[in-house]
Amino acid sequence: MKVLQEPACVSDYMSISTCEWKMGGPTNCSAELRLLYQLVFQSSETHTCVPENNGGVGCVCHLLMDDVVSMDNYTLDLWAGQQLLWKGSFKPSEHVKPRAPGNLTVHTNVSDTVLLTWSNPYPPDNYLYNDLTYAVNIWSENDPAYSRIHNVTYLKPTLRIPASTLKSGISYRARVRAWAQHYNTTWSEWSPSTKWYNSYREPFEQR
């Protein structure tokens, strides 16, 4: 049994780190492998993660952790029974992938504006809470040529779009993702998309 692609881990900077790797051949990850992790810290214990399959040769493990602080450093050992397949380390604060924003809602009852709101995925006491900026992707299933990214660089999780900039009488979809500039994170996954129908029509005298 051999590791083809070494574990790569990212932290949500809250309570979960996710490690993914590829094996040299088809593997029943949960039955054959264990990923052991231990914080480099006085009197810490070794904890065990049972991986899941992620495709034929891929495995993924969700490591449960306490809140993350910059000093945290973990040793990682990938075992197949009594055989140590790989040994490494992981500093969560240096490999952050934020949680995806949630509760994306479209409000179309605001006169001539489409208002999008979503929820910050972190509690106020988390360091990332006040550091997230967002990208909102809006596209149309009726008009495949239309796809826009709106960068939201302010803290409030809202975006206002003049309804007049969208075609009337067709449906649109939106999704949102986040990143934290000061923590040099990757982008989060996209939120689930939400759909709305743009029924806005310009006033008669403007046509």
Epitope: S43, S44, E45, M71, D72
Partner: antibody, heavy 125, light 112 residues
């Protein structure tokens, strides 16, 4: 009531052995790391050894490394310190103390918040 | 190893007056914001040590509020706002960030 009671001290000749015990009660013993601290006559406090809650991780002062062994039996709620190759400078009162909660991924520390009454070890010919 | 240096080593105090003991570590014992791994212990004559302050500034259960801890990184202070006769004994700071845990030399507080 949370309590630690040491036993096993006594008079021993240089080169001899002693085994100290520390019985814990009133708390979930296996969840906490435990520590031994000693105090030579008229001197300050000196850390000797610590062990994680599971017993899987042990730590020693350089002055006792290779001679002392810390262990625990969580089924008996008891901490041990096996002292071999004793020297005159090991003469001290030995205290056990309740250390950090080590079942969490990052152990939670509340100080050495419970101490035993101490047991006296005298090494002399 | 982290060396802990206490001062003064002897502290005569008048009852009702404040007292202050300093402890300096040879390297930072700050793990993360608010988590300085320094404790303060009091050992009264013929007794086991008792915890006063942990993590730099957190008062242990049952400890009178006249005791307080402060500091961060390498410099720490134990303050007694109004010394009482029962406060006499040896005061020790200790770092527990990493083994070996190390204690200061001890400060003997006595009543004038």
């Amino acid at each position: 009531e949370v309590q630690l009671v040491e036993s096993g001290g006594g008079l021993e000749q240089p080169g001899g052995s002693l085994r100290l015990s520390c019985a814990g009660s009133g708390f979930t013993f296996r969840d906490f790391a435990m520590t031994w601290v000693r105090q030579a006559p008229g001197k300050g406090l000196e850390w000797v050894s610590s062990v994680s809650g599971s017993g899987g991780n042990t730590y020693y002062a350089d002055s006792v490394k290779g001679r002392f062994t810390i262990s625990r039996d969580n089924s008996k709620n008891t901490l041990y310190l096996q002292m071999n190759s004793l020297r005159a400078e090991d003469t001290a009162v030995y205290y056990c103390a309740k250390d950090r909660l080590s079942v969490t991924v990052r152990p939670r520390y509340y100080g050495l918040d419970v101490w035993g009454q101490g047991t006296t070890v005298t090494v002399s010919s | 190893d982290i060396v802990m240096t206490q001062s003064p080593l002897s502290l005569p105090v008048t009852p009702g007056e404040p007292a202050s003991i300093s402890c300096r570590s040879s390297q930072s014992v700050l793990y993360s914001i608010g988590y300085n791994y320094v404790d303060w212990y009091l050992q009264k004559s013929g007794q086991s040590p008792q915890l006063l302050i942990y993590l730099g500034n957190k008062r242990a259960s049952g400890v009178p509020d006249r005791f307080s801890g402060s500091g961060s990184g390498t410099d720490f202070t134990l303050k007694i706002s109004r010394v009482e006769a029962e406060d006499v004994g040896f005061y020790y700071c200790m770092q527990s960030l990493t083994s070996p845990y190390t204690f200061g030399q001890g400060t003997k507080l006595e009543i004038k």
